[in-house]
């Protein structure tokens, strides 16, 4: 927890942020909360970013004040105006860019005092993998595909039956650059799979970890996948 200290005799108020990650091309949230004030007109929210000339966003006297907003953020930011009164200063960032990564500061002024907290925002691409049986292959083969990742992730296969086994010799992973020249499609193929087993394709970079599971039996195929963002921590 980081407490913003008051300046020139004003009290300090507690401001809390949570480190988070944004998925390139999608909308993201930069989380920030503060001790609420009873009067909306007394609350000022400023979002700043290291390396930015001006402000990312400013909200004061109950509305956006964007005269000093940096051009790179123009039209891409919004606070949750109806939640400011209850202490929510989180910022919605539209169409997240790779270059939006960095250190942000959520700076709050209320009638009670001032406070700020930094937030480390990571950007990249992450998507859910899908594992399928590759019926075109000569032997029993699984194919794990995920459409968008950045930075380049690692791919590891695992199986429920052969726990701890290393599948690197019987798998092949490729990365294909997508049309926007940043994110990549991940394709990993696992050979010599056995029936009545559950296989997992785990894709991970420094932003996210995603797993695609497939259970192949004589009678059916069951699939499951999940994605987890890494390094979300409060300040």
């Amino acid at each position: 927890l980081i407490i913003g200290f008051g300046i020139s005799g004003r009290h300090s108020i507690t401001v809390t942020t949570v480190a988070s990650a944004g998925n390139i091309g999608e909308d993201g949230i930069l989380s920030c909360t503060f001790e609420p004030d009873i009067k909306l007109s007394d609350i000022v929210i400023q979002w700043l970013k290291e390396g930015v000339l001006g402000l990312v966003h400013e909200f004061k006297e109950g509305k956006d004040e964007l005269s000093e907003q940096d051009e790179m953020f123009r039209g891409r930011t919004a606070v949750f105006a109806d939640q400011v009164i209850v202490g929510n200063a989180s910022l919605r960032l539209k169409n997240v860019q790779l270059t939006d990564a960095g250190t942000y500061k959520c700076y709050i002024i209320t009638s009670k005092g001032k406070g700020n907290a930094n937030l480390e925002y990571k950007t990249g691409a992450f998507s859910m993998p899908e594992v399928n049986v590759d019926y075109n292959a000569s032997s029993e083969t699984l194919r794990c595909e995920a459409p968008r990742w950045f930075p380049q992730p690692t791919v590891v296969w695992a199986s429920q039956v052969d726990q701890g086994a290393n599948f690197s010799e019987v798998s092949n992973t490729s990365f294909e650059l997508n049309s926007e020249n940043v994110t990549m499609k991940v394709v990993s193929v696992l050979y010599n799979v056995t029936i009545n087993n559950t296989y997992s394709c785990m894709i991970e970079n420094d932003i996210a970890k995603a797993t695609g599971d497939i259970k192949v039996t004589e009678s059916e195929i069951k699939r499951r996948s999940h994605l987890q963002l890494l390094n979300s921590k409060a300040s």
């Epitope: 000339l53 001006g54 907003q69 940096d70 790179m72 790779l98 960095g102 940043v182």
Partner: antibody
Framework: EVQLVESGGGLVKPGGSLKLSCAAS????????MSWVRQTPEKRLEWVAG????????YYPDTLKGRFTVSRDNARNTLYLQMSSLRSEDTAKYFC???????????WGQGTTLTVSS | DTLMTQSPSSMSVSLGDTVSITCHAS??????IGWLQQKPGKSFKALIY???NLEDGVPSRFSGSGSGADYSLIISSLESEDFADYYC?????????FGGGTKLEIK
């Protein structure tokens, strides 16, 4: 067409002061952040100052803080750099650079030369 | 400060060659890097922004690549007007910092 024209350079004695100007045209000046960059005689580039679109936020390298002051007059479409306590190492060609839609160094002026010598 | 180490400082190349100029940042800069061209006695022209994006009006023989702390400017099929000085600049952190420059000369 975006145009940035610097002026005000010249020969100054060590310890002296000088104010540079950058006249902008061809774009909505008040919308964009601006910077001053200098190029030393050895062709090394150094960012000198930056200012937000409205002029309320200014930024400097620690090495120049206190001696250099950047300002802007959006009504006149002009950027300024006030320099004081000048030293021989401030001798350089000074360029103004405008942020465009893409980044902080999209457009550049032709530069104005400052020589600090006794 | 973020130190930008640019290499090579100069290179002699022939027309039609492909060249690569690299910049290494002393810390990650999240693609907040631009590439600039300066012709003798002239000002600067922006070529690449955000590491990989081509500025409007810049020929497609120029391209940028990289991520994290390492970035490159690639010029394919060099033409006579490409012989100039090239600089990288990072705008991820204050103070903004520039590479030392690369002089492209005709062999």
């Amino acid at each position: 067409e975006v145009q940035l024209v610097e002026s005000g350079g010249g020969l100054v004695k060590p310890g002296g002061s000088l104010k540079l100007s950058c006249a902008a045209s061809g774009f909505t000046f008040s919308r964009y952040a601006m910077s001053w960059v200098r190029q030393t005689p050895e062709k090394r580039l150094e960012w000198v100052a930056g200012i937000s679109s409205g002029g309320s936020y200014t930024y400097y390298p620690d090495t120049l803080k206190g001696r250099f002051t950047v300002s802007r007059d959006n009504a006149r479409n002009t950027l300024y750099l006030q320099m004081s306590s000048l030293r021989s190492e401030d001798t350089a060609k000074y360029f103004c650079a405008s942020q465009g839609s893409n980044h902080y160094f999209d457009y550049w002026g032709q530069g104005t030369t400052l020589t600090v010598s006794s | 400060d973020t130190l930008m180490t640019q290499s090579p400082s100069s290179m002699s190349v022939s027309l039609g060659d492909t060249v690569s100029i690299t910049c290494h940042a002393s810390q990650g800069i999240h693609n907040n890097i631009g590439w600039l061209q300066q012709k003798p006695g002239k000002s600067f022209k922006a070529l690449i922004y955000h590491g990989t994006n081509l500025e409007d009006g810049v020929p497609s023989r120029f391209s940028g690549s990289g991520s994290g702390a390492d970035y490159s400017l690639i010029i394919s099929s060099l033409e006579s007007e490409d012989f100039a000085d090239y600089y990288c600049v990072q705008y991820a952190q204050f103070p903004y910092t520039f590479g030392g420059g690369t002089k492209l000369e005709i062999k």
